[in-house]
């Protein structure tokens, strides 16, 4: 707290700005004003990242208005140094109190390649597995010191469930955070609205990103499912193909079974929906069999789970490789 | 020019500076520093990209230093007006001349978003139509008064042909910028480097693309075609599916064709090239054919282009709705 | 794939002359790109010596213009560095490349595994 | 001329760290957005190699380990993590300008 018997300064930092194309000038100028204070001895400072600067300032010389001083402290710096993102303080030292203004260049107004996305529960999860979770995706993050913060909110105002997070450093550099956050089957099929909002140092605003039940029009897949023939040179193997069409909503899973055994998922490859030329949606599936499976069991089960199927969300299709036989 | 009897001022705007932590603060104050000039009538205005503002400023008394007199004029404005991009001049009239600067946000510094990509020739064009062409593709881009430039090179240092530019603002509010550049069809299968280099004021650096032939083993499609059966509810319809696997490298094109005619590429569905097991790649296509076509003639050919499928790179399959009759 | 081949190094005496060449198979040079000499004395750092470009232009570093020539030979498919007045200073690995063109910038993309100048008496 | 400076001349460090080299230009080498710097690797007997291409490229078959940085006189080369076969001189080159030089080397040893 100050005594009575003099008026603290108010230290303010301006900056040069840039031109009336945008473009930041070859040098930057910061000018630390500090003002309204009763005429005394004042020391200033300057701080990058917090440590002092060993530079020679322009410091204006001291003007009197009234009974109140200022001054002024101009500090130059390359475009490169400001651009580096680091932080820049004016120290002012008067009557043994220490008063201070900081800046940094302005994080990017519009940060377009942070984007974020919320999946809804793959209906696999929903409706077999009954432990449907959503997941919070936050992509092309730069790096910072700052943290990422995902949280999770319902429309409804009731409690979530306690989240997980994965952070990735991607081969270009960038950050990818996830959140996965478990949700009620009853909840989701009852239309819950979830929302996941993300903060960031560096974002000028938070990031919404919403989810619920898609609404619409409801429509089982049919599935076809098709073998290749031998083909010359891979006798061993063999190609089975599954389309799934005309389904609505696009929300979908696909399994493989061999043995009434569904087959892991890096063993098949299956596509994003697509549209019709309808109104509703297709998928392809494709997975590659050996000779020792089909000749163990010949016959391979493309199964689809989706909403509107019925009985029990699923529909499929078995195919054997040589089905004469 | 100014008469030798008196010294015309320097302009210079100032901007209130973000926090510590880059944040912009919820208003900007622009300060108009007018200095250096005889005394004399000032008259300050402050334009908003080239209109004369109807404002309120805070215009400080001038000061004088020995001979020459300075002026400062204040602008207050809203942290949604700052990041709208808008340009801020502050115009001096004095003995009959006009001085001014001018300011905007500076322009995002890391503008992640911006992406440029450049394809290789279809398959199609090479081979078959045998004029292929290369597009230089930039997305993500703010829509701004800077130009876009695309500028094509050629590894060989050989002239480049005359390239076709197309500009498409998305509805998000980005701009999205084509160039397509011809080239030679043996000056690429030769192995020709082609370079894209995209510059754009708001891009702190120029973005560089090359494209050139893939390098690497070659494998021709495998192609296979399958009909859907009947399916309650669609009699006058049905689906076709066409499975290409295993070829390299991934560069395909694949069309559909009924009585000797290529139909039209918005009437089939085909994926992007994925990666099977192996070392190759697959892609399925779809394509809804009606009654009409099939009673008319109940062949359907899926047909692939790719280099290394022999003879003329191309290699197909038919298929028929009904194949017993 | 393009390669590059030199010969002609070895030992010669000051003030001595000598004639390296650089056999290109894969590519021809007339086609494109600009070809180049670099060299590395014993033990040292790069410099770039002369170019000649696919349509018969040349360039040389200002160190050794009026010394050395670089000429080509269209049917053999081949470039040369003419190497003339040879001092101590020459001697050095010289190896010859295939430069990459970028909007009228060069760098230096293909080499060959070099030859071994040595000016000495 | 245009001179480039690298630092450190050589440098001793072990499978797994994180190496960074610095190339320093007498004047700038960046024009209309582009930077003209390029990193070679050359290993004893051998022809040089490129790695990156106008400051930050890295080229067709280079490990993502590689990366450059930098732009008008201030430059970096680093290799995120150091394999065996990293082991090698660095130059850096500058093809701004007429006549094309080269840093003078940096020598990555074994610690």
């Known amino acids: 707290v100050c005594s009575r018997d003099f008026t603290p300064p108010t230290v303010k930092i301006l900056q040069s700005s840039c031109d009336g194309g945008g473009h930041f000038p070859p040098t930057i100028q910061l000018l630390c004003l500090v003002s309204g204070y009763t005429p005394g001895t004042i020391n200033i400072t300057w701080l990058e990242d917090g440590q002092v600067m060993d530079v020679d300032l322009s410091t204006a010389s001291t003007t009197q208005e009234g009974e109140l001083a200022s001054t002024q402290s101009e500090l130059t710096l390359s475009q490169k140094h400001w651009l580096s993102d680091r932080t820049y303080t004016c120290q002012v030292t008067y009557q043994g109190h220490t008063f201070e203004d900081s800046t940094k260049k302005c994080a990017d107004s519009n940060p377009r390649g942070v984007s974020a996305y919320l999946s809804r529960p793959s209906p696999f999860d929903l409706f077999i597995r009954k432990s449907p979770t959503i997941t919070c995706l936050v992509v092309d993050l730069a790096p910072s010191k700052g943290t990422v913060n995902l949280t999770w909110s319902r429309a409804s105002g009731k409690p979530v469930n306690h989240s997980t997070r994965k952070e990735e450093k991607q081969r270009n550099g960038t950050l990818t955070v996830t959140s996965t956050l478990p949700v009620g089957t009853r909840d989701w099929i009852e239309g819950e609205t979830y929302q996941c909002r993300v903060t960031h140092p560096h974002l000028p605003r938070a990031l919404m990103r919403s989810t619920t039940k898609t609404s619409g029009p409801r429509a089982a897949p049919e599935v076809y499912a098709f073998a290749t023939p031998e083909w010359p040179g891979s006798r061993d193997k063999r190609t089975l193909a599954c389309l799934i069409q005309n389904f609505m909503p696009e929300d979908i899973s696909v399994q493989w079974l061999h043995n009434e055994v569904q087959l892991p998922d890096a063993r098949h490859s299956t596509t994003q929906p697509r549209k019709t030329k309808g109104s509703g949606f297709f998928v392809f599936s494709r997975l590659e069999v050996t000779r020792a499976e089909w000749e163990q069991k010949d016959e391979f089960i493309c199964r689809a789970v989706h909403e509107a199927a019925s009985p029990s969300q699923t529909v499929q299709r078995a195919v054997s490789v040589n089905p004469g036989k | 020019v100014c008469s030798r009897d008196f010294t015309p001022p320097t302009v210079k705007i100032l901007q209130s500076s973000c926090d510590g932590g880059g944040h912009f603060p919820p208003t900007i104050q622009l300060l108009c520093l007018v200095s250096g000039y005889t005394p004399g009538t000032i008259n300050i205005t402050w334009l908003e990209d080239g209109q004369v503002m109807d404002v309120d400023l805070s215009t400080a008394s001038t000061t004088q230093e020995g001979e020459l007199a300075s002026t400062q004029s204040e602008l207050t404005l809203s942290q949604k007006h700052w990041l709208s991009d808008r340009t801020y001049t502050c115009q001096v009239t004095y003995q009959g001349h006009t001085f001014e600067d001018s300011t905007k946000k500076c322009a995002d510094s890391n503008p992640r978003g911006v992406s440029a990509y450049l394809s290789r020739p279809s398959p199609f064009d090479l081979f078959i139509r045998k004029s292929p062409t290369i597009t230089c593709l930039v997305v993500d881009l703010a829509p701004s008064k800077g130009t876009v430039n695309l500028t094509w090179s050629r590894a060989s240092g050989k002239p480049v042909n005359h390239s076709t530019r197309k500009e498409e603002k998305q509805r998000n509010g980005t701009l999205t910028v084509t160039s397509t550049l011809p080239v030679g069809t043996r000056d690429w299968i030769e192995g020709e480097t082609y370079q894209c280099r995209v510059t754009h004021p708001h891009l702190p650096r120029a973005l560089m693309r090359s494209t050139t032939k893939t390098s690497g083993p070659r494998a021709a499609p495998e192609v296979y075609a399958f009909a859907t059966p009947e399916w309650p509810g669609s009699r006058d319809k049905r689906t076709l599916a066409c499975l290409i696997q295993n070829f390299m490298p991934e560069d395909i094109s694949v069309q559909w064709l009924h009585n000797e005619v290529q139909l039209p590429d918005a009437r089939h569905s085909t994926t992007q090239p994925r990666k099977t097991k192996g070392s190759g790649f697959f892609v399925f296509s779809r394509l809804e054919v009606t009654r009409a076509e099939w009673e008319q003639k109940d062949e359907f050919i899926c047909r692939a282009v790719h280099e290394a499928a022999s003879p003329s790179q191309t290699v197909q399959r038919a298929v028929s709705v009904n194949p017993g009759k | 794939e393009v390669q590059l081949v030199e010969s002609g190094g070895g030992l010669v005496q000051p003030g001595g002359s000598l004639r390296l060449s650089c056999a290109v198979s894969?590519?021809?040079?007339?086609?494109?790109?600009?070809w180049e000499w670099i060299r590395q004395a014993p033990g040292k750092g790069l410099e770039w010596v002369a170019s000649?470009?696919?349509?018969?232009?040349?360039n040389y570093n200002p160190s050794v213009k009026g010394r050395i020539t670089i000429s080509r030979d269209d049917s053999k498919n081949t470039f040369y560095l003419q190497m003339n007045s040879l001092r101590a200073e020459d001697t050095a690995v010289y190896y010859c490349a295939r430069a990459t063109h970028y909007f009228g910038h060069h760098h230096f993309a293909v080499w060959g595994q070099g030859t071994l100048v040595t000016v000495s008496s | 001329d245009i001179q480039l400076t690298q630092s450190p001349s050589s440098l001793s460090a072990s499978v797994g760290d994180r190496v960074t080299i610095t190339c320093r230009a007498s004047?700038?080498?960046?024009?209309?957005?582009?930077?003209?710097m390029n990193w070679y690797q050359q290993k004893p007997g051998k022809a040089p190699k490129l790695l990156i291409e106008w400051g930050s490229y890295l080229r067709s078959g280079v490990p993502s380990r590689f990366s450059g940085s930098g732009s008008g006189t201030d430059f970096t080369l680093t290799i995120s993590s150091l394999q065996p076969e990293d082991f090698a001189t660095y130059y850096c080159q500058q093809n701004a300008e007429d006549p094309y030089t080269f840093g003078q080397g940096t020598k990555v040893e074994i610690k």
């Open positions: 004047q700038s080498v960046d024009y209309h957005g582009d930077s003209y």
């Open positions: 000649i470009h696919y349509d018969g232009s040349t």
């Open positions: 894969g590519y021809s040079i007339t086609s494109g790109h600009r």
